[in-house]
């Protein structure tokens, strides 16, 4: 929930904004509704459709330390426990992520499990 102070020539000093609700599907262009006293306003907004948003913002996890390197796969893993989910996000309770053992190589963390679908 976002609050904004409106200073210029407005009766309302504080608008309260709801979530950005896509017009269709789960992402893309949509509207955000604001209220201030008896006034309401709708503004255009956009929910990103990228992987980072789907995994990074909808479902937040608290991670353990990285485990030991698995010599057979050349990767190490750690487990994450759900910390917070967007209200309508169907997140897994726990996820397991892996990454290459070599700390020199920069590569993106790969998620074995992300948001779950029923």
């Amino acid at each position: 929930k976002k609050k904004e102070k409106v200073k210029k020539g407005s009766e309302c000093s504080e608008w309260t904004w709801g979530p950005c609700t896509p017009s269709s599907k789960d992402c893309g262009m949509g509207f955000r509704e604001g209220t201030c006293g008896a006034q309401t306003q709708r503004v255009h907004c956009k929910v990103p459709c990228n992987w980072k948003k789907e995994f990074g913002a909808d479902c937040k996890y608290k991670f353990e330390s990285w485990g030991a390197c698995d010599g057979s796969t050349g990767t190490k893993a750690r487990q994450g426990t759900l910390k917070k989910a967007r209200y309508n996000a169907q997140c897994q309770e726990t996820i397991r992520v892996t990454k290459p053992c070599t700390s020199k190589t920069k590569s993106k963390t790969k998620a074995k499990k992300g948001k779950g679908k029923d």
């Epitope: 269709s24 989910a85 209200y87």
Partner: antibody
Framework: QVQLVQSGAEVKKPGASVKVSCKAS????????MNWVRQAPGQGLEWIGM????????ILNQKFKDKATLTVDISTSTAYMELSSLRSEDTAVYYC??????????WGQGTLVTVSS | EIVLTQSPATLSLSPGERATLSCRAS??????LHWYQQKPGQAPRLLIK???QSISGIPARFSGSGPGTDFTLTISSVEPEDFAVYYC?????????FGGGTKLEIK
């Protein structure tokens, strides 16, 4: 499975305040949104607001912004709702419910708050 | 805020009959619509989430359809324990809102 146990019935005078508690046991209390809903006698359900225990983010129904205050105590896995400036119209059963979009929700048994002079 | 209108207000059926309960939203709410059952003196119980997703422990005779603005809860064959009040709720935008309820009563 999550179990929610709410505090007992309260009788209050107009103008007073009341604090209703909702103690969770079972799965992680801090991971899920806690909703508060009220139901006046013989009436339907009305959403008051919700709070997330992990960071206390709170979203209140504007109708209750001067009436309800939501808090949590992570150490005891308890959510609280304080209602101020009570009026007879606030007489209702107040429910807490823990929400997960993946598994659904779990509800407390309800707390009857009666406001009477 | 989004207004949910439930119909009919009261539905009178005999055990074994098919029940169709309607919930209409004042604007499109995607599939963010949930169905609850409430019996006297009890807390509401979630039957269906996100228009059509089943809930663990809820009998298969309960099903839901959507998305958009028009939603339906269907009880394929009403059992004696199904007589109760049914509410729809939307979680598409704040404030969360409930419909006025449909009372399913014995004919």
């Amino acid at each position: 499975q999550v179990q929610l146990v709410q505090s007992g019935a309260e009788v209050k005078k107009p103008g007073a305040s009341v604090k209703v508690s909702c103690k969770a046991s079972g799965q992680s209390f801090s991971s899920y949104w806690m909703n508060w809903v009220r139901q006046a006698p013989g009436q339907g359900l009305e959403w008051i607001g919700m709070i997330h225990p992990s960071d206390s983010e709170t979203i209140l129904n504007q109708k209750f912004k001067d009436k309800a205050t939501l808090t949590v105590d992570i150490s005891t896995s308890t959510a609280y709702m304080e209602l101020s400036s009570l009026r007879s119209e606030d007489t209702a059963v107040y429910y807490c419910s823990s929400w997960s979009a993946k598994r659904g929700d779990f509800w407390g048994q309800g707390t009857l708050v009666t406001v009477s002079s | 805020e989004i207004v949910l209108t439930q119909s009919p207000a009261t539905l009178s059926l005999s055990p074994g009959e098919r029940a169709t309960l309607s919930c209409r939203a004042s604007e499109s709410i995607s599939n963010n619509l949930h169905w609850y059952q409430q019996k006297p003196g009890q807390a509401p119980r979630l039957l269906i989430k996100y228009a059509s997703q089943s809930i663990s422990g809820i009998p298969a005779r309960f099903s839901g359809s959507g998305p958009g603005t028009d939603f339906t809860l269907t009880i394929s064959s009403v059992e004696p324990e199904d007589f109760a009040v049914y509410y729809c709720q939307q979680s598409n935008s704040w404030p969360l809102t409930f419909g006025g309820g449909t009372k399913l009563e014995i004919k």
